[in-house]
Amino acid sequence: ASNFDCCLGYTDRILHPKFIVGFTRQLANEGCDINAIIFHTKKKLSVCANPKQTWVKYIVRLLSKKVKNM
């Protein structure tokens, strides 16, 4: 759920880390209404996720580690 590059809500499904290639942080104090993690998938989709959810935190950590190792 995004509009003009801002997430307006969060996905209600789980993404497996193997389908995600990167992420962007959306901050509520930088022009958007809510904090969000925008996951970028292999199929070139952008998915808005709740940064407070456990599965989101795990994937962010896994992706951050992957970037460091590159």
Epitope: I14, H16, P17, N35, N50, P51, K52, Q53, T54, W55, K57, Y58, I59, V60, R61, L62, S64, K65
Partner: antibody
């Protein structure tokens, strides 16, 4: 009723490895985040890392990266923690713990509601 | 070293109200839910408060949690002898991309 049953105490030599198991019963296994937490004698709690079994890939505290391996076997509902190149400072009680909500409902990441009784690992020459 | 700072000890007499503080930063407490654990001597930790101020079932409402900015606190009212334990705050840290515990506070009932 969720129960986490850990393997028994271990005495290890410096430089060796230890593998501690944590069998979960009474709930779905694969969609919950499991953490490993340790506590050295007289010290505080230290988060070591965790795994969401359905994700397969674990995450680790930066301090233990390279020495710690966390795995999960969904066929036996068991999580494992292996620590290599042990040193005396690794002497501690090692706990496995499961989060309050499953990987989707939890918006309080790290709310570790269910705990094993702990496994004492002693590293001594 | 722990990223969340707590006083090493706190004390009170039976029936009193005691507060334990937990100080962090924007990357942990400021942006994430705070959880509190109670550890009785020789036992595994027990989740006392989750999501800043929520009680798991079975936890008496004598225990309450609050959060403001980058600090959190745990209040114990109507102090009882069985409350004598170590208390830890904890939160996810977005800079470390991991979970962090506070330094721990030993609560003594005088």
């Amino acid at each position: 009723q969720v129960q986490l049953v850990q393997s028994g105490p271990e005495v290890k030599k410096p430089g060796s490895s230890v593998k501690v198991s944590c069998r979960a019963s009474g709930g779905t296994f694969s969609t919950y985040a499991f953490s490993w937490v340790r506590q050295a004698p007289g010290q505080g709690l230290e988060w070591m890392g965790g795994i969401i079994p359905v994700f397969e890939t674990p995450i680790y505290a930066q301090k233990l990266q390279g020495r710690l391996t966390i795995t999960a076997d969904t066929s036996t509902d068991t999580a494992y923690m292996e620590l290599s190149n042990l040193r005396s400072g690794d002497t501690a009680v090692y706990y496995c713990a499961r989060e309050w909500g499953d990987y989707y409902s939890s918006v309080s990441s790290g709310a570790l509601h269910y705990w094993g009784r702990g496994t004492l690992v002693t590293v001594s020459s | 070293q722990a990223v969340l700072t707590q006083p090493s000890s706190a004390s009170g007499t039976p029936g009193q109200r005691v507060t334990i503080s937990c100080s962090g930063s924007s990357s942990n407490i400021g942006n994430n839910a705070v959880n509190w654990y109670q550890q009785l001597p020789g036992t595994a930790p027990k989740l006392l408060i989750y999501n800043n101020n929520q009680w798991p079932s079975g936890v008496p409402d004598r225990f309450s949690g609050s959060k403001s900015g980058t600090s959190a606190s745990l209040a114990v009212s109507g102090l009882q002898s069985e409350d004598e334990a170590d208390y830890y705050c904890a939160a996810w840290d977005d800079s470390l991309n991991g979970y962090v515990f506070g330094t721990g506070t030993q609560l003594t009932v005088l």
